[in-house]
């Protein structure tokens, strides 16, 4: 029933989409963990972060995101509908001055170290396409999201209606 | 704008299966998630389901063993379908849109009017 | 479920009283709360969502607030066009339950 195109028609003008004021409309702590139920944690190597996906011990402690949540606007000749179209992004931050962000060269998920206000790369169009499940995709390259591939986070290009549910790409937030 | 509008029977058998059309404009389908919602003579509100913007469904525990909801992007509609039905699913049933593309968490600012079905011999 | 528990299930008040309805969800719920007006024979109207934002069109003497699993709709003066019948809503996860309803009935 959903072609990606209606995806990308939607999202081509993620660049040019203004976030509604400069706060968050709403922040939210939560672990982030696979559709599979393995675990996003974060380490600090070297004086960086790495991302790991990985299952915990019984007992062992999630780590939390700072989930921050903007309301983007959408002209509605950019969004395909009738009116003007409200989409949410959200910025995810492990810790203190450290976002996520999307490399879409490397295809890669990294954590930046940055100040605010952050850059576009730190910014991501949230789906909820499945049961109690989101998705996250790049507002710098639309129809690109955040994925599992070898136990770590990429991004991984969504090309057809079929992988829009498609499992490496789902993600549940926990407040436990 | 944005516009739902409801449409089928007014009156189901019991053990019939209830089908009901939300047709709606000013909006792209594909963009967006839409629920159903009914509302029983005198009582408050009870979600039925959403089928979302990627086109998978969710549906009230109670009622998933009887409902599908379908869409026919060619023909600008959502569908109902709830089958073995009782009196007790007498109600006014409501389609509503999304706030946000691609996700619920905004709620419904646009609804249809709503239509009533009966389920009566 | 997820179970949402609006209070009082109905309550009476006059023109310009400041007008208070609770939700209380039974697990955290973040703040995807949406609250509804509804008068008799029409459809309903989203006044608050993602619990403290107010809706295109709403007048500001509606606000919201609240996280986690308590949540309130505060009316700060209440106008003629304001007896109704109010919801929660929560948009957590599915199933999205409604509260039972306020309504809001003139003294």
């Known amino acids: 029933a959903f072609g990606i195109s209606g995806v990308q028609k939607y999202t081509r003008a993620l660049h040019d989409s203004s976030i509604t004021g400069i706060s968050p409309i709403t922040e939210y702590l939560a672990s982030l963990s696979t559709y599979n139920d393995q675990s996003i944690t974060f380490a600090l190597e070297d004086e960086s972060y790495e991302i790991y996906v990985e299952d915990l011990k019984k007992d062992e402690k999630k780590d939390k995101v700072l989930l921050s949540y903007y309301e983007s606007q959408h002209p509605s000749n950019e969004s395909g509908d009738g009116v003007d179209g409200k989409m949410l992004m959200v910025t995810l931050s492990p810790t203190k001055d450290f976002w996520l962000h999307a490399n879409n060269k490397e295809h890669s998920v990294e954590l930046h170290k940055c100040e605010k206000p952050l850059p576009d790369q730190a910014f991501f169009v949230l789906h909820n396409m499945h049961s109690n499940c989101v998705s996250f995709e790049c507002k710098t390259d639309p129809g690109v999201f955040i994925g599992v591939k070898d136990n770590h986070l990429a991004l991984i290009k969504v090309d057809s209606s079929e992988n829009l549910c498609t499992e490496n790409i789902l993600f549940k937030l926990s407040e436990t | 704008q944005v516009q739902l509008q409801e449409s089928g029977p007014g009156l189901v058998k019991p053990s019939e299966t209830l089908s009901l059309t939300c047709t709606v404009s000013?909006?792209?389908?594909?963009?967006?998630?839409v629920h159903w919602i009914r509302q029983p003579p005198g009582k408050g509100l009870e979600w039925i389901g959403v089928i979302r913007a990627g086109g998978s469904s969710d549906y009230n525990s109670a009622l998933m063993s009887r409902v599908t909801i379908s869409v026919d992007t060619s023909k600008n509609q959502f569908s109902l379908k709830l089958s073995s039905v009782t009196a007790a699913d007498t109600a006014v049933y409501y389609c509503?849109?999304?706030?946000?593309?691609?996700?619920?968490?905004?709620?419904?600012?646009?609804w249809g009017q709503g239509t009533l079905v009966t389920v009566s011999s | 479920d997820i179970q949402m528990t609006q209070s009082p299930s109905s309550l009476s008040a006059s023109v310009g009283d400041r007008v208070t309805i609770t939700c209380l969800a039974s697990?955290?719920?973040?703040?995807?709360l949406a609250w509804y007006q509804q008068k008799p024979g029409k459809s309903p109207k989203l006044l608050i969502y993602?619990?403290?934002r107010l809706a295109d069109g709403v007048p500001s003497r509606f606000s919201g607030s609240g996280s986690g699993t308590d949540f309130t709709l505060t009316i700060s003066s209440l106008q003629p066009e304001d007896f109704a019948t109010y919801y929660c809503?929560?948009?957590?996860?599915?199933?999205?339950?409604f509260g039972q309803g306020t309504k809001v009935e003139i003294k």
């Open positions: 809503q929560q948009l957590y996860n599915t199933p999205y339950t």
């Open positions: 509503a849109r999304d706030h946000y593309f691609s996700n619920s968490y905004g709620g419904s600012p646009y």
């Open positions: 993602a619990a403290t």
């Open positions: 697990q955290t719920i973040a703040t995807w």
């Open positions: 000013g909006f792209s389908l594909t963009n967006y998630g």
